[in-house]
Amino acid sequence: EEELQVIQPDKSVSVAAGESAILHCTVTSLIPVGPIQWFRGAGPARELIYNQKEGHFPRVTTVSESTKRENMDFSISISNITPADAGTYYCVKFRKGSPDTEFKSGAGTELSVRAKPS
């Protein structure tokens, strides 16, 4: 069986301030078991945007029913975008454990924020 891949098809997305941004992410396998997390940026300074497992992420909604066992689409929508949201977003698969460990990351999607049209 082929190893899981995390696919972020869009290299970049541009959104006007105040609008919503859709960031696409799919995985190619249900194995290994474990949650998806979204981050803005890479390395230790990265910001947690969404954690499928726990937490309260009011501006983020999942595009599909990510809680379904067979789901492989982990795309998200971020509402009310501001300039501070600009950056590269990574969809990251974790392997279930105590604690969960990072398994594989997508290539990233760069979000740029345009001025709100007047």
């Epitope: 230790p44 910001e47 947690l48 937490g55 309260h56 992420f57 501006r59 009310n80």
Partner: antibody, heavy 119, light 108 residues
Framework: DVQLVESGGGVVRPGESLRLSCAAS????????MNWVRQAPGEGLEWVSR????????DYAESVKGRFTISRDNSENTLYLQMNSLRAEDTAVYYC????????????WGLGALVTVSS | ETVLTQSPATLSVSPGERATLSCRAS??????LAWHQQKPGQAPRLLIY???NRATGIPDRFSGSGSGTDFTLTISSLQTEDSAVYYC??????????FGGGTKVEIK
């Protein structure tokens, strides 16, 4: 219910150090950025520092940069502020504040810890 | 760096009357503005976020309006327990996070 409880305040002399703690409960601490905000006697609110959810990203106000260090222990649900080379102008009540989401407002505040720097 | 200017510095209002507080940003902050209430000797408390949304447990006599650079907090019928300092906070551009200088609401 969300609770934020600061401790570690006190009276110190200029140039000395102090470490504040903020014990958090009632929410998923490791999922939220946290902040320190201070208020000098009779003055308004001044943002001091921010730390991202994982602890690897930090920001500071220019007035404390190089002297204060923010950190967190997600296993203990605790936020810290290490304050070195304290000055009289650092005298204030220090509040820890939870951030609603990573790029958002402060939705819960602690009761505050008083730090007095005086010779 | 965005500067927030609150006016008036002090507002004296009779119980049951309307109080109108203003917060002006030096550049657009979209709808990313919050209002916090601080009663004497207490910690701040979130009242309004995203310019118009009331936080959990906040009475409906508090309302927020505005977008861009001009924002208003309205207390429709002032109660004695509303005596406090009110601060606006922007979170459109950061760091640093900025607060306004505050408006003190006194009961006549």
């Amino acid at each position: 219910d969300v609770q934020l409880v600061e401790s570690g305040g006190g009276v110190v002399r200029p140039g000395e150090s102090l470490r504040l703690s903020c014990a958090a409960s009632g929410f998923s601490f490791s999922s939220h950025a946290m902040n320190w905000v201070r208020q000098a006697p009779g003055e308004g609110l001044e943002w001091v520092s921010r730390i991202n959810s994982g602890g690897g990203g930090t920001d500071y106000a220019e007035s404390v940069k190089g002297r204060f260090t923010i950190s967190r222990d997600n296993s203990e649900n605790t936020l810290y502020l290490q304050m070195n080379s304290l000055r009289a102008e650092d005298t204030a009540v220090y509040y820890c504040a939870k951030q609603y989401d990573w790029n958002g407002f402060f939705d819960y505040w602690g009761l505050g810890a008083l730090v007095t720097v005086s010779s | 760096e965005t500067v927030l200017t609150q006016s008036p510095a002090t507002l004296s209002v009779s119980p049951g009357e309307r109080a109108t507080l203003s917060c002006r940003a030096s550049q657009t902050v979209g709808s990313k503005l919050a209002w916090h209430q601080q009663k004497p000797g207490q910690a701040p408390r979130l009242l309004i976020y995203d310019a118009t949304n009331r936080a959990t447990g906040i009475p409906d006599r508090f309302s927020g309006s505005g977008s861009g650079t001009d924002f208003t907090l309205t207390i429709s019928s002032l109660q004695t327990e509303d005596s406090a300092v009110y601060y606006c906070q922007q979170y459109y551009y950061w760091p640093p996070y900025r607060f306004g200088g505050g408006t003190k609401v006194e009961i006549k």
